[in-house]
Interface confidence: medium
């Protein structure tokens, strides 16, 4: 989650928080994560940390859905303190907001080493396939916050560990884009509650993982249909009539193009879109807003003010995506411009560090796409051609010298405009 900085408040998941304000983050598909506390610090940074639970000195500690740590029965809060979030009904059982439970039969492709973990959040049931670690003991035990059984003493799976061999299954690498992380930046190997992080950070790529690969978290959203009348489905505040299809818009990830939901009477059914392994062309290309790659020749979704004669080509020249990231911290602005190329398949990242208008540092990194997809804050800004990129880099060399000795206000922003391709008029290429 990109955090915007300001003297008086913090921005987190499109919500404003006052300095000193504390909250539990809302993470799809788990809902409110009570075991993480976030605070808005004075410098506008959001700091999140895992709740450390004290040892409880009783034989049967009780788990309360809206509290992270187990409590002894005699120290429970009075009933009227109960959080008044919407409960969920699933298979005839009512679950409180924040409650985790196990479901059977939701996923046809469930592997023997997987179980279905569900959680109730704001009246919706979120379920995911969780791949369980191989057990090395004869008598595994059940734990309250996981559908996987564990060996005694192994129950604590913390975000601080960075050895992700259990939960980070790489089967469909397209789907392994990290979602934009806040400042606690848990390693990609462990996620909230031990479930793999929901994929699809940058919506122009990535998808839910292929359930046949038995990896990642395959999410099935079962809407609580109580109080809903008529043949409609409600998703993300929008109403859909029976038979209508849409791409879900998940709070932390934006629109997930690789999932298609259909309204079936009053129940939304969501399916992963399967992209072909092979394409009839040599270099199929990714279009923003589309799940699968498209062969040149099929009309592209145009970026504002740009015209491509066929997919990915501008005036006969191949185009490549350009990403931008601007991050401000402690009066320093780090601006990154990244060009993704297919031959060689890498991402060229140009990094500018500016303090009080003076260029402090400029360097270029060539990184793998895998590494790029794990970097937060990047947004697709345009597509450009190699010739425009060459003009950009030449201009960049000039202003990198110029701006290291005098204050520059808009030079870099102006230079970035070179990368935007003008709408072509016939015969004016």
């Amino acid at each position: 989650e990109q955090v915007k900085h300001s003297e008086t408040y913090c921005m987190f998941q499109d919500k404003k928080y006052r300095v000193g304000e504390r909250w539990h983050p809302y993470l799809e598909p788990y809902g409110l994560v009570y075991c993480v506390n976030c605070i808005c610090s004075e410098n506008g940074n959001v700091l999140c940390s895992r709740v450390r639970c004290p040892n409880v000195h009783c034989l049967s500690p009780v788990h309360i859905p809206h509290l992270c740590c187990p409590r002894c029965p005699d120290s429970l809060p009075p009933v009227n303190n109960k959080v008044t979030s919407k409960s969920c009904e699933y298979n005839g059982t009512t679950y409180q907001h924040g409650e985790l439970f196990v479901a059977e039969g939701l996923f046809q492709n469930r592997q023997p080493n997987q179980c279905t973990q569900c959680s109730c959040s704001e009246g919706n049931v979120y379920c995911g396939l969780k791949t369980c670690p191989k057990l090395t003991c004869a008598f595994p035990v059940s734990v309250p916050d996981s559908c996987c059984r564990v060996c005694r003493g192994d129950g604590e799976l913390s975000w601080e560990h960075s050895d992700g061999d259990i939960f980070r299954q790489p089967a469909n690498r397209e789907a392994r884009h990290s979602y934009h992380r806040s400042h606690y930046d848990p390693p990609p190997s462990r996620q909230a509650g031990g479930l793999s992080r929901f994929p699809g950070a940058r919506s122009h790529r990535g998808a839910l993982m292929d359930s046949q690969q038995a990896s990642g978290t395959i999410v099935q959203i079962v809407i609580n249909n109580k109080h809903k009348h008529g043949q409609v489905c409600v998703s993300n505040g929008k109403t859909y009539s029976h038979g209508e299809s849409w791409h879900p818009n998940l709070r932390a990830f934006g629109i997930v193009e690789c999932v298609l939901c259909t309204c079936n009477v009053t129940k939304q059914e969501c399916k992963k879109i399967h992209c072909p392994n092979r394409y009839p062309c040599k270099y199929p290309q990714k279009i923003d807003g589309k799940c699968c790659k498209v062969c040149p020749g099929k009309k592209a979704k145009e970026l504002p003010g740009q015209s491509f004669d066929n997919k990915g080509y501008f005036c006969g020249e191949e185009t490549m995506p350009v990403y931008e990231s601007v991050f401000m911290e402690d009066g320093e602005t780090t601006r990154k411009i990244a060009l993704e190329t297919e031959r060689p398949p890498q991402v060229e990242v140009h990094v500018w560090t500016i303090r009080k208008g003076i260029l402090q540092h400029f360097h270029i990194e060539k990184i793998s796409k895998r590494m790029f997809e794990e970097l937060p804050h990047f947004k697709l800004v345009t597509r450009t051609t190699l010739s425009q990129w060459k003009i950009f880099t030449e201009g960049e060399a000039q202003i990198s010298q110029m701006c290291s000795s005098r204050v520059c206000r808009t030079e870099l922003e102006d230079l970035v405009k070179v990368l935007y391709l003008e709408r072509s008029e016939k015969g004016h290429c």
Partner: antibody, heavy 121, light 108 residues
Amino acid sequence: EVQLQQSGPELVKPGASVKISCKASGYTFTGYYMNWVKQSPEKSLEWIGEINPRTGGTTYNQKFKAKATLTVDKSSSTAYMQLKSLTSEDSAVFYCARDYGSSPYWYFDVWGTGTTVTVSS
Amino acid sequence: EIVLTQSPALMAASPGEKVTITCSVTSNITSSNLHWYQQKSQTSPKPWIYGTSNLASGVPVRFSGSGSGTSYSLIISSMEAEDAATYYCQQWSSYPLTFGAGTKLELK
């Protein structure tokens, strides 16, 4: 030219530890995952684990979790692997290997020169 | 973990002969996640074929790869002396990443 230069051969006593290095050159070190692979006559090639040089985040093969520790030094573009409590079964050639990392293909596109570790009393 | 079984373990081929090395996988994997490496004595492995059928840089066109699901092959259309080496298949479909035991190809 992209190169991974590994440290020289090691002769160590059982129970001891050893730390081998892999110096990267010719590319952005923090831009590609680094993997470690063990090659022994009995077991052929075995993947030990990977490290993200940018964050230091690691993923291990469960089998080597208690045996190997992967680290990096970004300033010198060097990856390290420490092996502890060595036994004769740990005698092998160890390779570092770069993850090509460009979807949809993920494979080891550049391999290190290899470090031979011999455990003997 | 996914186990890769290569066959044959050892084989000899004459110059000009067609060679096929197979790699059998214990569970279905996507073809983009199956790779082949070549290793000659006393040297490091080299990427040879990636994503089932794509030749790595500098690999002669007499090499090809095919397969899907659980069965994959490396093919040499016409054996040459420089092809004598050990070939390993490897999967990158799920952790831990695993390799086949290798096929040693000798020149007859």
